[in-house]
Every structure is written in structure tokens, then in C-alpha cells.
Interface confidence: medium
């Protein structure tokens, strides 16, 4: 019972979802599941049945390693997918799949809230927008990156001659992908262009 | 040793509503399926859902969709299954069961409820 | 839905007899059938999975066969102990559903 991968794959890409291990040998059948009843497909030793699902036309079946393959992979389809199998001795096993599906990040925009000349330092609010997306931030200066505790959507500093860049660069995250948008000042503490 | 430990007897007025816990000792939830099975005096028995507390899903049985609500809390390894808008039908012993997802192999003692105004 | 259909609804028995219940789906399961046995008052207990695969701990005097929509759990020698009565489940989809239930009695 305690066969559960997770997988991370991007949208509009082409998966395979199959096992580490071998299959048991000579198996009666094996049934692909999505969530709990959607049945995706069924092998039963001599042929492979399709169910009428949202994935027809787009899943094979590999009946000798299990792996079920489907097609340009989208948002909705994550899910947790079962396969089950029954032996030929007449017990039966499972595997889960969790799959997670994630758009490609857009690119980032990077508004500046605040910019002010203090007495040559230069004080610093930079946002970094991308629509509801669950990502992680990094922030870099000049291709250095910002110090950890500063990385979220905002970052807000003061800078002063000695540790001064040119440009900000805000990168933008998740499992499958990232993006970067950069903004750069003319010293001492102006927007120099996008 | 692996164990179902479900909360004890509910006496309920028709309208209200029932939540009866299931907990797991000796075991956790994560990768596991819980289903609720309920039995009326001197009937057989009558599958009402499964829930799936490491993914969140659930599935209930079209009857009791609408009034029926599967939830859990994974640090406690417990899972809670509430029924609304009681009527005197649903005097029966409810059952969790589960950790198998094609059949039950280990069931909970039930917990008796009664609906009576 | 599945519809499980059991027979016969009770059987009365002498000990050391032969005891045979069927059930029947109205569709073709395979052989994704389960067998439970339950005592009054007491959680039932499963006998049998995937049709004919003994769970661990139940006597080998049980046992189940039959694949498609026809299965059958047989007691090959009936004890005292015996006695309660036995579910049939369909395991193959969902929603899960029982049959009606065989009720076993010792003569």
C-alpha cells in the first residue's frame, strides 16, 4: 500500500506515468484510475480498453511496463492516478501517482513604489508582479543575489555608495520554471529604463 | 497494532446534525483512503463515502451528496464524517473502514446514532 | 450503480455441513469481488478480496470463486462459529455497493 511518487511536470508537455519497479509477472490485469472512479483505461491480457473520460484520444497504455502515457498535460488534470493491478495469484496492488501540473511562470513585472535620494544613500521599494501565482522570489543586484530574509515580492533596501547597483533583477519561480524582469537606475537613484 | 478508534453514541432531533470522528492508532493517514459505511437496525449495509486525507479528495455516494461532509486532521490522524438535516432514516451504526482502497480490510467498532424528536 | 444481488437471504446448517452463497452483479466486475462475514452487533470482517484470495487469518475452510458476475464464497465445513452473516462488494468502481446480505444459522 505504500506506493505513492509525486511528479512535477509543466503544462502542455507529454508525461509518462509509470512505476519504479517491475511489474508482477504475468498479471491478470491493470486498471489506470483517475482520482478514485474515473477509470482512464483497462488491460485485461488480451486487449486495452479506453473509457469515455476527458483523457480518450490522448492516453496509451504500455501493457508491458505499465506506463501510461498521456498528452499534453493541463492544469486540470492534477490528481492523484492509481494503477491497479490483480496477479495472476489473485492478490492485488496498487501504486499512486500524485500529479502536479504547473503553468510555465509568466514574466514578471517590476514596479518601483518607492525611489528616494537620501543624503546619497538611496532608498529602495521594488515589487515584483506576476497574476496569482504560487512562486518563489529571488532578488539580485547587479547579477548578485539579495540576501535570503529579502526574498519575497517585494524588496525594499538602502543602498549606499559602497554596495550601489545598477540593476535589479527579480526572478520569478516555480518547479518547472522560472522568468526574470529587470529595472535598472542612473545613480545617484533614478529610473534609468525597463 | 493497527487500529480504528471512532468517537461514542449520538442521539440527535431530526434537523440537526451528527459529526463522528475516526481515529487512527498505531498507523497515520498519509497515503491512506478512509470510507464510511452505515448499517439501520436489521438492514444490510450501505457505503456512503471515501476521503483521501494525504490529497484532499472525496467521494460520496449520490444519496447522501449535499449533506454529507468528509474531513480530517492529518496531525491527529483522525477523520471526521458530518451528516446534516438528520431524519429518523438515518438511525444506524456508522462505520469507518478502510485503509485499503479497493476493499476494507480493517473497520472501525461503529458508532451508534439515534434521530428521534 | 452495480447492483450486488445475494442468495439465498438465509440458510440454516448443521455443523460439518457444506454451505454455498452466490452473488450476482449486474455488470461485469472481473474479478473485483470482496466477501465479509459480521456477528450481531460487531463491525464486519473481511473474509475473502479480488474474489478468491483468502485475507490473512481466516480459516482456509472459506474460500471464493467465480470472476465476470457470477462469484461464490463457499464453507466447506461449517462450525459453531460460523454463524452471522455474510456481505458480498463489489470493488471494481464506485459508488461501493453490497449485496443484501446471506444470513447464516447453525442447526
Known amino acids: 500500500q505504500g506506493h505513492l511518487v509525486h511528479m512535477t511536470v509543466v503544462s502542455g508537455s507529454n508525461v509518462t506515468l509509470n512505476i519504479s519497479e517491475s511489474l508482477p509477472e504475468n498479471y491478470k490485469q491493470l486498471t489506470w484510475f483517475y482520482t478514485f472512479d474515473q477509470k482512464i483505461v483497462e488491460w485485461d491480457s488480451r486487449k486495452s480498453k479506453y473509457f469515455e473520460s476527458k483523457f480518450k484520444g490522448r492516453v496509451r497504455l504500455d501493457p508491458q511496463s505499465g506506463a501510461l502515457y498521456i498528452s499534453k498535460v493541463q492544469k486540470e488534470d492534477n490528481s492523484t492516478y492509481i494503477m491497479r493491478v490483480l496477479k495472476k495469484t489473485g492478490n492485488e496492488q496498487e501504486w499512486k501517482i500524485k500529479l502536479q501540473v504547473l503553468d510555465p511562470v509568466p514574466k514578471p513585472v517590476i514596479k518601483i513604489e518607492k525611489i528616494e535620494d537620501m543624503d546619497d544613500n538611496c532608498y529602495l521599494k521594488l515589487s515584483c508582479v506576476i497574476p496569482g501565482e504560487s512562486v518563489n522570489y529571488t532578488w539580485y543586484g547587479d547579477k548578485r543575489p539579495f540576501p535570503k530574509e529579502l526574498q519575497n515580492s517585494v524588496l525594499e533596501t538602502t543602498l549606499m555608495p559602497h554596495n550601489y547597483s545598477r540593476c535589479y533583477t527579480c526572478q520569478v519561480s516555480n518547479s518547472v520554471s522560472s522568468k526574470n524582469g529587470t529595472v535598472c537606475l542612473s545613480p545617484p537613484c533614478t529610473l534609468a529604463r525597463s | 497494532q493497527v487500529q480504528l478508534v471512532q468517537s461514542g453514541a449520538e442521539v440527535k432531533k431530526p434537523g440537526a446534525s451528527v459529526k463522528v470522528s475516526c481515529k487512527a492508532s498505531g498507523h497515520t493517514f498519509t497515503n491512506y483512503y478512509i470510507h464510511w459505511v452505515r448499517q439501520a437496525p436489521g438492514q444490510g449495509l450501505e457505503w456512503m463515502g471515501i476521503?483521501?486525507?494525504?490529497?484532499?479528495?472525496?467521494r460520496y455516494a449520490q444519496k447522501f451528496q449535499g449533506r454529507i461532509s468528509m474531513t480530517w486532521d492529518t496531525s491527529t490522524s483522525t477523520v471526521f464524517m458530518e451528516l446534516s438535516s438528520l431524519k429518523s432514516e438515518d438511525t444506524a451504526v456508522y462505520y469507518c473502514?478502510?485503509?485499503?482502497?479497493?476493499?476494507?480490510?480493517?473497520w472501525g467498532r461503529g458508532t451508534p446514532v439515534t434521530v428521534s424528536s | 450503480d452495480i447492483q450486488m444481488t445475494q442468495s439465498p437471504s438465509s440458510v440454516s446448517a448443521s455443523v460439518g455441513d457444506r454451505v454455498t452463497i452466490t452473488c450476482r452483479a449486474s455488470q461485469d466486475i472481473s474479478s473485483w469481488l470482496a466477501w465479509y462475514q459480521q456477528k450481531p452487533g460487531k463491525a464486519p470482517n473481511l473474509l475473502i478480496f479480488?474474489?478468491?484470495s483468502l485475507q490473512s487469518g481466516v480459516p482456509s475452510r472459506f474460500s471464493g470463486s467465480g470472476s465476470g458476475t457470477d462469484f461464490t464464497l463457499t464453507i466447506s465445513s461449517l462450525q459453531p462459529e460460523d454463524f452471522g452473516t455474510y456481505y458480498c462488494q463489489q470493488t471494481d468502481n464506485f459508488p461501493r455497493t453490497f449485496g443484501q446480505g446471506t444470513k447464516v444459522e447453525i442447526n
Open positions: 476521503t483521501n486525507p494525504n490529497d484532499g479528495n472525496t
Open positions: 479480488a474474489a478468491s
Open positions: 473502514a478502510g485503509l485499503r482502497y479497493w476493499f476494507f480490510d480493517l
